[in-house]
Interface confidence: low
């Protein structure tokens, strides 16, 4: 505990390592013939305290013993945990200009004795691994602390390893470098950790374990799957394992799933049959192992095997709908539409659809395959027709779905009543209706069909539809519904051989239109004025237009204009008014109204009727 320096020595009592809360005496002594020249009595020894290389205190006032000019003893208290540096310097008081000269220094370490190590945990990775133990060291000692891990077992087996903790490294784990073999499966082993530093020592409680307690098998490797006869639902999972494994846990899931299917397999010997897989589905498989049925630890999960199950022929029924359009007196165009099967029904990549149109008396059959989800043909208007569609993948085809081609809106008695369309939120519309009042045949199902009321939508875009059971009188439509767009919604009631429909317009959100209709002409016929206009461009309508309003007033008049409100009909683009005085010049304009309000006015036109007014 003495640091030999040129000018003198510094000693510490009781020791340079002390427990927290203890005091220490530091003595600084000059060597013979050292000190201030000529006047030994002018030697003044001072003690400086440094923490982290920063001067924090001059201990001049803590002097407890002084041999003038030869040695001084200082008492230091309240030292904080860790290392503190003390430097003794010589101050020659007769020479104020010279700085104090360093004599010697000492480092004092303040710490605590180690706590008994706790929570010892040992593990051997695989049958050929080595035993490694970790523990909780307890509170930081702030001193270099040595740890000894000792293992003892049968046949006088003993083994020990050491490591230390200090301010740079932490010792809470040691690998003993020995391998426990399965033939010692029933044997008991004891480990103990001893901690020792300059302030004391402590020992853990003995920790007892068996081979099975600590050996964690290596995860299975070389995982593969064999699909029996290219089946999409049955496969044999195979893997390699360590020799002593008796229990496996398998987990597998479709890649987009959030929950695993779990299977326990005893004595599987690297093989297990799975029977409930979904065809044409990306799966992830993992396996874990255990060396004993009741004791021991599971291995980590193996690396994932990711693979797609093979295809199987499609199942399920295609959802078919159609449109009929008369071309002339003896021909009609039939457009068939169907929805793609969902993946669990398609069970593979759909390569094509088989479409059949057949006259019921079997006189005519039209057949085709298509990769699209629609098909159009011109057929005679005579006869009763039926259509069927099936979906095919590489393994086969689904059962055909049949639909009778009837006149969808041909039977007034089958028309649903009180059809309404209410906006529910930005992207759906609630459609409700009442059943037909006097249907002479039972309603088998309702079809709610909708399409945007925009130019060319019948030819450009397929319809959207929902099939509704006959006892339901409402449907929430959301597919392809956008705000500020007006949709034509039809509710069809279908019986076995007839159809009736009712139509309504609806939107999911609306605003007042951006502009009013543009008046294109005002003509006078038989004492009535006919106002003609062009409809508001589709993007500017911003929902379903309920009314048009025609305003007029005498030119230069300050009176309120008169107005005529007309129900909006897409097909109508002119309207008569008959309350204008002859030979008076009027200004006329139009606006459009949605459920959200009225548009700004359209263009103004002046007109002076000539004829006799009513």
């Amino acid at each position: 505990n003495i640091d030999v320096c040129k000018l003198g020595t510094v000693t510490v009592q009781p020791a340079p390592v002390i427990p927290l809360g203890s005091a220490a005496n530091i003595s600084c002594s000059l060597n013979p013939k050292q000190g201030c020249s000529h006047y030994p009595s002018s030697n003044e020894l001072i003690l400086l305290k440094f923490v982290n290389d920063v001067l924090v205190e001059n201990l001049h006032g803590k002097k407890v013993h002084d041999h003038t000019g030869h040695s001084s003893t200082f008492q230091v208290t309240n030292l904080s945990l860790g290392m503190t540096l003390f430097v003794c310097k010589l101050n020659c008081s007769n020479s104020q200009k010279k700085p104090p000269v360093p004599v010697c220094g000492v480092e004092i370490s303040v710490g605590v004795a180690p706590e008994p190590p706790q929570n010892i945990s040992c593990v051997q990775e695989g049958e050929n691994g080595t035993v490694a133990c970790s523990w909780n060291s307890g509170k930081v000692t702030y001193l270099k602390t040595n740890y000894t891990l000792q293992l003892s077992g049968p046949n006088n087996l003993t083994c020990q390893k050491q490591c230390f903790s200090d301010n740079r490294q932490n010792c809470n784990r040691l690998d003993l470098g020995i391998n426990l073999s399965p033939d010692l499966a029933e044997s008991r082993f004891i480990v103990r950790v001893t901690a020792i530093n300059d302030l004391g020592n402590s020992s853990s409680l003995p920790h007892t374990f068996t081979f099975l307690d600590i050996v964690i098998p290596l995860p299975p490797w070389d995982i593969r799957i064999n699909f029996l006869n290219a089946s999409g639902s049955r496969g044999t999972l195979q893997w390699e394992d360590e020799g002593q494994v008796v229990l496996n846990q398998l987990r597998y899931q479709p890649l987009n799933s959030t929950s695993w299917n779990m299977v326990n397999a005893t004595n599987a010997k690297g093989k297990y049959d799975l029977r409930d897989l979904r065809p044409f589905t990306e799966y992830e498989f993992q396996i874990s192992s255990k060396l004993h049925l009741s004791g021991g630890s599971w291995s980590n999960w193996s690396e994932s095997l990711r693979t797609r199950t093979p295809e199987e022929e499609p199942v399920g029924i295609l959802d078919i709908w159609y449109m009929k359009q008369d071309i002339d007196y003896d021909r009609q165009q039939i457009s068939l539409f169907w929805k793609s099967l969902n993946p669990s029904e398609a069970r593979g990549k759909i390569l094509h659809y088989q479409v059949t149109l057949q006259e019921v008396t079997k006189k005519t059959t039209l057949q085709n395959t298509t990769r699209h989800t629609s098909w159009t043909r011109v057929i005679p208007r005579t006869g009763a027709w039926t259509a069927s569609v099936s979906a095919a993948n590489s393994k086969g085809a689904s059962a055909p779905t049949h639909i009778n081609i009837v006149d969808l809106c041909g039977t007034g008695l089958l028309a649903p009543h009180q059809v309404s369309a209410k906006s529910e939120n930005m992207d759906n519309i609630l459609v409700t209706w009442q059943p037909p009042k006097k249907a002479d045949s039972a309603v088998r199902e309702y079809i709610v069909e909708w399409r945007a009321l925009q130019p060319g939508s019948i030819t450009k875009f397929p319809p959207h539809w929902l099939r509704i059971p006959p006892d339901n009188m409402s449907a929430l439509i959301s597919e392809n519904i956008k705000p500020y767009i007006c949709y034509e919604i039809r509710v069809h009631a279908l019986s076995e051989s007839q159809g009736g429909c009712s139509s309504i317009r609806g939107d999911s959100k609306h605003k007042a239109p951006v502009s009013g209709p543009h008046i294109t002409a005002i003509t006078e016929k038989k004492e009535r004025l006919f106002i003609s206009w062009t409809h508001i461009p589709f993007p500017e309508q911003r929902g379903c237009i309920l009314h048009y309003r025609i305003y007029w007033k005498e030119r230069d008049s300050t009176a309120q204009p008169e107005l005529c409100e007309i129900q909006y009909r897409r097909s109508q683009n002119s309207h008569p008014i008959s309350s204008l005085q002859p030979r008076v010049t009027y200004v006329l304009w139009m606006t459009a109204v949605t459920a959200a309000g009225e548009s700004p006015q359209g263009n103004e036109r002046e007109f002076c009727p000539q004829g006799k007014a009513n």
């Epitope: 945990s121 593990v123 990775e125 932490n170 784990r173 690998d175 980590n300 999960w301 690396e303």
Partner: nanobody
Framework: QVQLQESGGGLVQAGGSLRLSCAAS????????MAWFRQAPGTEREFVAG?????????FYDDSVKGRFAISRDSAKNTVWLQMNSLKPEDTAVYYC?????????????????????WGQGTQVTVSS
């Protein structure tokens, strides 16, 4: 979806230093075991350093880097760092960041590739002599 993105690799002279960073997105990684592995051409991917993720974050190092490399994490920033000092030519490799979404406290498990369920794309470190 969880993603790990390494950065900070590059070319450095022997004896120099580099600091690798691994940014995790998609989940909070403060409780998960995190590790750095490396793979030199023609060799298996090997453990370099790891954090146990057991709340108190025990640090683990391969013997070959002990005293030279330091692993740390900033949970608030979802970032794990590897400070590499006194680099040697044999440290040349692609360095990968890995995360295990279950807490791992055994040294043996921390070292195993199979423990980790998320991996980054890697960053190249080249140490020239």
């Amino acid at each position: 979806q969880v993603q790990l993105q390494e950065s900070g690799g590059g070319l450095v002279q022997a004896g120099g230093s580099l600091r690798l960073s691994c940014a995790a997105s998609g989940r909070t990684f403060s409780n998960y075991a995190m590790a750095w592995f490396r793979q030199a051409p023609g060799t298996e991917r090997e453990f370099v350093a790891g954090l146990s993720g057991s709340g108190g974050d025990t640090e683990f190092y391969d013997d070959s880097v002990k005293g030279r490399f330091a692993i740390s994490r900033d949970s608030a920033k979802n970032t794990v760092w590897l400070q590499m000092n006194s680099l040697k030519p044999e440290d040349t490799a692609v360095y990968y960041c890995a995360a295990a979404t279950h807490v791992v406290v055994h040294y043996g498990l921390v070292r195993r590739r199979g423990t980790y369920d998320y991996w980054g794309q890697g960053t190249q470190v080249t140490v020239s002599s």
